[in-house]
């Protein structure tokens, strides 16, 4: 079945596709839509690139890496409850039975309740806010936004998130990268 | 809602052109993948192929030799031609579109017969 | 082409029963298959896209099932309605192929 990416209420939602041109400014037509990849195209088109540029998106829907280079991977801003449900990344590459058809789920839950402040303020400020996950594609910044105050027994569970969430990554870009050419 | 209708000769003899029309109301052919499935009177469906909103076409391999599928923008009509007909061409020719088949026509039957 | 070999080709249940019908794809086709009714004299309806997303306005009396190249697909609380062909198609590359159709009857 699909592979399942997570996000909270009123953060950045990430979708990795990716693909590798087969000469640099070669690109392929790529459409993005919700649900699942139909017979043609994409349904619901939120966003479309063609050989050289982004030719259609709509709000909150864009391409936070380098495209040019393959890196089409869907970033959808402040995501709701709404924005649950499967993403269509299709490759459209020239030729007979050629499209390569990606369906991603994407699970919204909730935001998290920020607890009340706690002593351990002094360590947050050090904390970085900012996770980097680097798989087969270029770096992907997850902005966290504000974090909750931590507490000395919350950081192996962040920290165990952040494993979680580069190995969750490699396997994104494993799955969903194709090479033309 | 989108809406398919095909129309065209019910009897045509073999070795004959067959000539079907597609005239679709509640969108534009501009947008969206326009295609000819029929079905054969043993009940098997056979997919034929499509005009895309840009002109672009695909046919089914197996009778790429003797299809064509035009469209007329204008009139917001699309064609299929069907060359050398035999009797097993005889069918109900359906026109469909929609992002997984959602709009069909209800059918022509077509008989090819001397 | 990719092959779907359906069966039952035909099938008789009671009115509130229900029925399954399945696919065998002669590859994997990733889930990419739909389900059709068909009525004599119309066109058919699509009632089910990618394995099990049911089409808005089917009853959630249609369900879809399967992965890989099996795949299944059921009528629950079968109605008078009912009654039609029904046909699996394969979408996972432009070579479309349906099945052969399964005729449901009500006894």
């Known amino acids: 079945s699909e592979v399942e990416y997570r996000a909270e209420v009123g953060q950045n939602a990430y979708l990795p596709c990716f693909y590798t041109p087969a000469a640099p400014g070669n690109l392929v037509p790529v459409c993005w839509g919700k649900g699942a990849c139909p017979v043609f195209e994409c349904g619901n088109v939120v966003l479309r690139t063609d050989e050289r540029d982004v030719n259609y998106w709509t709000s909150r829907y864009w391409l936070n890496g380098d495209f040019r280079k393959g890196d089409v991977s869907l970033t959808i801003e402040n995501v709701t409850l709404a924005d649950s449900g499967i993403y269509c990344c299709r490759i459209q590459i020239p030729g007979i039975m050629n499209d390569e058809k990606f369906n991603l789920k994407l699970v919204i839950k909730p935001a998290k309740v920020t607890p009340a402040p706690t002593r351990q303020r002094d360590f947050t400020a050090a904390f970085p806010r900012m996770l980097t996950t680097r798989g087969h594609g270029p770096a992907e910044t997850q902005t966290l936004g504000s974090l909750p105050d931590i507490n000395l027994t919350q950081i192996s569970t962040l920290a165990n998130e952040l494993r979680d969430s580069r190995l969750a990554n490699d396997l994104r870009d494993s799955g969903a990268t194709i090479r033309i050419g | 809602d989108v809406q398919l209708q095909e129309s065209g000769p019910t009897l045509v003899k073999p070795s004959q052109t067959l000539s079907l029309t597609c005239s679709v109301t509640g969108d534009s052919i501009t947008s969206g993948y326009w295609n000819w499935i029929r079905k054969f009177p043993g009940n098997k469906l056979e997919y034929m192929g499509y005009?895309?909103?840009?002109?672009?076409?695909y046919y089914n391999p197996s009778l790429k030799s003797r299809i064509s599928i035009i469209r007329d923008t204008s009139k917001n009509q699309y064609y299929l031609q069907l060359n050398s007909v035999t009797t097993e061409d005889t069918a109900t020719y359906y026109c469909?579109?929609?992002?997984?088949?959602?709009?069909w026509g209800q059918g022509t039957t077509l008989t090819v017969s001397s | 082409d990719i092959q779907m070999t359906q069966s039952p080709s035909s099938l008789s249940a009671s009115l509130g029963g229900k029925v399954t019908i399945t696919c065998k794809a002669s590859q994997d086709i990733n889930r990419y298959i739909a389900w059709y009714q068909h009525k004599p004299g119309k066109g058919p309806r699509l009632l089910i896209h990618y394995t099990s997303t049911l089409q808005p306005g089917i009853p959630s009396r249609f369900s879809g099932s399967g992965s890989g190249r099996d795949y299944s697909f059921s009528i629950s609380n079968l109605e008078p309605e009912d009654i039609a062909t029904y046909y699996c198609l394969q979408y996972d590359n432009l070579l479309f192929t349906f099945g052969s159709g399964t005729k449901l009857e009500i006894k």
């Open positions: 469909v579109s929609g992002n997984h088949f959602d709009y």
């Open positions: 005009i895309s909103y840009s002109g672009s076409t």
